[in-house]
Interface confidence: medium
Amino acid sequence: FERTRSLQDPCSNCPAGTFCDNNRNQICSPCPPNSFSSAGGQRTCDICRQCKGVFRTRKECSSTSNAECDCTPGFHCLGAGCSMCEQDCKQGQELTKKGCKDCCFGTFNDQKRGICRPWTNCSLDGKSVLVNGTKERDVVCGPSPADLSPGASSVTPPAPAREPGHSPQ
């Protein structure tokens, strides 16, 4: 057991937050300011991420963990670990290389990010349009035209389609 220990890499004893300093007889030295080591046995410490520009600090760097960034208001994170920030747009718009642009007729976007998507084609499911679409909202599909013909049993429209204070006709 003793022999095994002596053959071990002495650096393996260095905990997170330190590095194995070759210049000092492989002593475990604390990570310098603005650097960290998240695992033991490391021969160098990594430079802390700096959150600047549109990035803002969500979690400060410590000797054992990197800083974490998010995006300033008006932007949202993209990529692993918020590696990029992308500009928000208003609902009813999409981000293009020319900035935020309104959704074309027949498309909508109900979020501040992403692209405009086509309205649902109700007729593909044999249904009719109950509520028209807008730039911000998809159409609401209702019962099929056949269900609304005279003599057919009455169908209650889905709850979200009703306007507040109005009962179904």
């Epitope: 993209l78 992308e86 290389k97």
Partner: nanobody, 123 residues
Framework: EVQLVESGGGLVQPGGSLRLSCAAS????????MTWFRQAPGRGLEWVAN????????YYVDSVEGRFTVSRDNAKNSLYLQMNSLRAEDTAVYYC????????????????WGQGTTVTVSS
């Protein structure tokens, strides 16, 4: 180290001109779209202009169209913003950022930012 450093800001009278520069280092500048943003006092960041890798595509926010010109010199790893007919409402900290297109069909993310340069338009 990947870095962007802006310069060229200053105090200018309304109607005057300034040319901002953004020096890039630590990455292959010619492979990236580049973008200018600005932040007026007490306001959020506003996209100003962007330019594609070879300078053949340029886009501007409506409020600066015809007054500002974005350009780049890939041999010098530099991005520029020529600002003419400046107005008081152009007063802001101006940032350059790496990116603006090329992260997927609908992604326009910026991953590297400079520290900003201040432009003040006042008489």
């Amino acid at each position: 180290e990947v870095q962007l450093v802006e310069s060229g800001g200053g105090l200018v009278q309304p109607g005057g001109s300034l040319r901002l520069s953004c020096a890039a280092s630590g990455f292959t500048f010619s492979s990236y779209w580049m973008t200018w943003f600005r932040q007026a006092p007490g306001r959020g960041l506003e996209w100003v202009a962007n330019i594609n890798q070879d300078g053949s595509e340029k886009y501007y926010v409506d409020s600066v169209e015809g007054r500002f010109t974005v350009s780049r010199d890939n041999a010098k790893n530099s991005l520029y913003l020529q600002m003419n007919s400046l107005r008081a409402e152009d007063t802001a900290v101006y940032y350059c950022a790496r990116g603006g297109l090329g992260y997927g069909d609908s992604h326009y993310g910026m991953d590297v930012w400079g520290q900003g340069t201040t432009v003040t338009v006042s008489s």
